[in-house]
Amino acid sequence: NKILVKQSPMLVAYDNAVNLSCKYSYNLFSREFRASLHKGLDSAVEVCVVYGNYSQQLQVYSKTGFNCDGKLGNESVTFYLQNLYVNQTDIYFCKIEVMYPPPYLDNEKSNGTIIHVKGKHLCPSPLFPGPSKP
């Protein structure tokens, strides 16, 4: 039995920040679980982890230098990524693992979300006119 995951097909990070919501076909509230967000077609980079246990506070961390936070809903985890760079535009996959009680469960691979990071638009400096020619 696999958990199904739904993600937005595409998100644009205008201010170098984005909320990515992972919606699951599963209630996480009475489970010990590990929700994670992975970058790249091969999911090679683990961007952020949300570890939950019904009796304790959420633990949110990144071991890959991303600035992230996480929020738990009944059947969802929302990852809030900040300080993204333009070159971090990529496809991001939600993953969920239910660790306890047994049996261990995880998800069918989702279609992923393309996060398009747009750099901050800096106002162009006015052109200083050169010295006027007589």
Partner: antibody
Amino acid sequence: EVKLQQSGAELVKPGASVRLSCKASGYTFTEYIIHWIKLRSGQGLEWIGWFYPGSNDIQYNAKFKGKATLTADKSSSTVYMELTGLTSEDSAVYFCARRDDFSGYDALPYWGQGTMVTVSS
Amino acid sequence: DIQMTQSPASLSVSVGETVTITCRTNENIYSNLAWYQQKQGKSPQLLIYAATHLVEGVPSRFSGSGSGTQYSLKITSLQSEDFGNYYCQHFWGTPCTFGGGTKLEIK
């Protein structure tokens, strides 16, 4: 068809031990938790604990620690509960039940027929 | 541990009437609650899971409601086969305590 077949009634002496069995069929034995429940005459249901045959994971109600021991034999798809140091308080019907996971919500949809244990000298 | 307070302990009603049994917990169990019916000499039968979801094959006169710490089982238009004992059970961690039970008798 999921079936939990429990062993027959037991008449035991105070201080003795008894081992009850719950044989599972109709599903993959190692994929589901089995719960044990006690029902004393004129009283309500009391949760004893659960056993997961896939990893031999166990959870006990603190009240039954030292009283009940849960084990399993994968080859025969059977979960056992041993009760030790029996007293009249242990006279009851004991049920095993399979826990199903309804998308993150648990319940016990399948129950054995129960085993009556009578403690008497 | 979570305490389950089920009420009433017993009630005597006539066929065709409506009854409501309640289960209160001492902390939020986030709808991780099941309801069972048990008849004399038989094994309990699951009626409702996740507080409100009716098990397939259970008549629609049974319904579950509630959230947080307060849950109810309602039986409308009682039939003779509905008489027996009813229990709630939580699955918010262990021990997975049962309520004290409600004995439903024919008036």
